[in-house]
């Protein structure tokens, strides 16, 4: 099984023990590590994003001297990059060709084994351009193989939301040109629903409405397969972060009304999102519940509510992906797991390690 783990370059800016650099990654933890994110320059070439990306690329790829089987990929795009710029590049032959031709030399120069596309998210008019972009990247990667130089890997991070899938992806077409698909089976539930809910339930909940039946890992995986994605190329996304809400009343169960996103974490400083190492802290004195249908936990403390993953829930998810004969798991993100071993002393990356152990 593959265990594909994302590293985020901005995690270096978190304060104190929250700061994370690639050399903190255990070399044998994951089979593939994806560095997020690279940029695309004004002349449509793959390029660095952070001032010290080159140094961090080097730190990441040095892990391969210890684990020679480790593969590294560079992810291009992301939320800040936006879908508009991707659309401008993919929809124009000249721009798209310039980008496609720039990718392999860039990856080779910095020691990466492949590219991950994080176009978040293609709109209806971009659907065919996204397919074309993937097809052309794969063709370029095939063409540039030479003895002593293996073919570069190509993956894509795809939304697990039904609307986004139907709108932006021709699954049958893109799946044949990708080595694997990173299915983002999280962020299913958010503040827009105005009630509490887990953002990555394995199965549909008993109380779920008609729309909610799409908002779970099981549905997304089965739907992708139905649309033509080979199970052997699908990686099920498992989050090491939780989604939090501020409760609107004393009601604190699943489906309780909310007034907004949860308070920002001490280190991640983003309302509505908590790293696992922040959740550990939150759990002290909190009320913990396990959703029997959804197979995931949530916790409440005061007016704060958080849906998250623990060792038990990730093991359940791995059991599911094995049953469905998927390619493996994807983790977002290493820097949001307890990489310092603060939850339980000397236990580093507990969630990712639990996934690794369950995959074995």
């Amino acid at each position: 099984y593959k265990l594909v783990c994302y590293f985020t370059s901005w995690s270096q800016y978190r304060e104190g023990v929250g700061s994370f650099l690639p050399d903190a990654i255990q070399p044998f933890l994951c089979t593939h590590i994806i560095y997020s994110f690279a940029n695309i320059s004004s002349d449509n070439m793959l390029s660095t994003w952070e001032w010290n990306d080159e140094s961090n690329y080097d730190k990441l790829n040095k892990l391969k001297t210890r684990n020679t089987n480790l593969k590294t990929l560079l992810s291009v795009g992301g939320w800040k990059f936006g879908e508009k710029r991707f659309s401008e590049i993919a929809s124009n032959t000249e721009r798209r060709t310039a980008f496609v031709r720039s990718v392999a030399p860039f990856l080779r120069s910095y020691g990466f084994d492949g590219l991950d596309l994080a176009w978040l998210y293609p709109r209806l008019r971009d659907k065919q351009y996204f397919s074309t972009l993937i097809k052309e990247l794969n063709a370029e990667f095939t063409k540039e193989v030479q003895p002593g130089r293996e073919k570069l890997l190509l993956s894509a991070a795809l939304s697990a939301g039904k609307v986004a899938i139907d709108t932006g992806y021709d699954i049958a077409q893109i799946a044949q040109h990708l080595d694997f698909i990173n299915l983002m089976t999280y962020d299913f539930h958010g503040v827009w629903r105005q009630i509490t809910g887990h953002h990555s339930p394995l199965f549909q909940g008993q109380k779920d409405t008609r729309f909610d039946r799409y908002s779970n890992v099981n549905y997304a995986v089965q739907y992708m397969i139905r649309l033509g994605a080979q199970a052997s190329k699908l990686l099920m996304g498992i989050p090491t972060f939780g989604k939090s809400f501020t409760l609107a009343s004393s009601e604190n169960q699943l489906g309780a009304p909310i007034s907004g996103e949860g308070l920002p974490g001490r280190f991640t400083k983003e309302a509505g999102t908590l790293a696992y190492y922040e959740i550990c802290d939150f759990l002290k004195g909190a009320e913990v519940h396990r959703l029997s249908n959804e197979k995931v936990p949530f916790a409440t403390k005061g007016n704060q509510w958080v849906g998250y993953e623990d060792k038990e829930s990730v093991k359940n998810k791995v059991g599911f992906l094995k049953e469905k004969k998927l390619a493996g798991a994807m983790v977002w993100a290493l820097d949001l797991d307890d990489f310092q071993g603060t939850c339980q002393p000397k236990e580093f990356f507990p969630l990712t390690n639990a996934i690794k152990d369950a995959l074995a």
Epitope: R101, S102, P105, F106, S109, Y110, Q146, P147, G148
Partner: antibody, heavy 125, light 110 residues
Framework: EVQLVESGGGLVQPGGSLRLSCAAS?????????MCWVRQAPGKGLEWIGC?????????YYADSVKGRFTISKHNSKNTLYLQMTSLRAEDTAVYYC????????????????WGQGTLVTVSS | DIQMTQSPSSLSASVGDRVTITCQAS??????LNWYQQKPGKAPKLLIY???SLASGVPSRFSGSGFGTDFTLTISSLQPEDFATYYC????????????FGGGTKVEIK
């Protein structure tokens, strides 16, 4: 001493054929190497002709200007590289160099670290 | 097909001068750009590989930089033995390649 020595050059008529040899000494043409031919017309710049990947002996790459006319091959036991040239033209007149590329690595790419002294081929009637 | 364009084609300079030669690739080649020095009647000699790595035995007055499509060879203080012709070469691919070398830059005594 590690060196490459070309031979086989000379005067040939247009339409004729010639086989150049490149003998490697001081090292064995190992499986990771690419062995290549580069030429230089009198008073002109360097022009890449083609390469062979020694590891397979079947992976060959040629410039469009010589494709179908020139063939690169190797003889393992003789530690020798060959350039078979057919349908020669006046514009093929040049000094022909044999060069060694140690093989691809992301760290360094392709480059010619070792060159022969060159052999002159003159195509004229 | 990757084309290499070198400029200038020739330049005149004096001993002690700082000399800069540029090379442009028709498409991105990452860091894979090499520089060679050639003297009359001699085979080319590798100076720099992978854009900025100095070949063995090459004096430190030679340096290279660049990434993608634009590259530079700099001789910080020209010495009498540096008067020669310099060639850039893309070191990225042998596939679908027409030449791979730039046209050359002849460095002459002013």
């Amino acid at each position: 001493e590690v060196q490459l020595v070309e031979s086989g050059g000379g005067l040939v008529q247009p339409g004729g054929s010639l086989r150049l040899s490149c003998a490697a000494s001081g090292f064995t043409i190992s499986s990771d190497y690419y062995m290549c031919w580069v030429r230089q017309a009198p008073g002109k710049g360097l022009e890449w002709i083609g390469c062979i990947y020694i590891g397979s002996g079947t992976d060959t790459y040629y410039a469009d200007s010589v494709k179908g006319r020139f063939t690169i091959s190797k003889h393992n036991s003789k530690n020798t590289l060959y350039l078979q040239m057919t349908s020669l033209r006046a514009e093929d007149t040049a000094v022909y160099y044999c060069a060694r590329d140690k093989g691809w690595s992301n760290a360094w790419g392709f480059y010619f670290q070792l060159w022969g002294q060159g052999t002159l081929v003159t195509v004229s009637s | 097909d990757i084309q290499m364009t070198q400029s200038p084609s020739s330049l005149s300079a004096s001993v002690g001068d700082r000399v800069t030669i540029t090379c442009q690739a028709s498409q991105s080649i990452g860091k894979y750009l090499n520089w060679y020095q050639q003297k009359p009647g001699k085979a080319p000699k590798l100076l720099i590989y992978s854009s900025s790595s100095l070949a063995s035995g090459v004096p430190s007055r030679f340096s290279g930089s660049g990434f993608g499509t634009d590259f530079t060879l700099t001789i910080s203080s020209l010495q009498p033995e540096d008067f020669a012709t310099y060639y850039c070469q893309q070191g990225y691919s042998y596939v679908d390649l027409e030449n791979g070398f730039g046209g050359g830059t002849k460095v002459e005594i002013k």
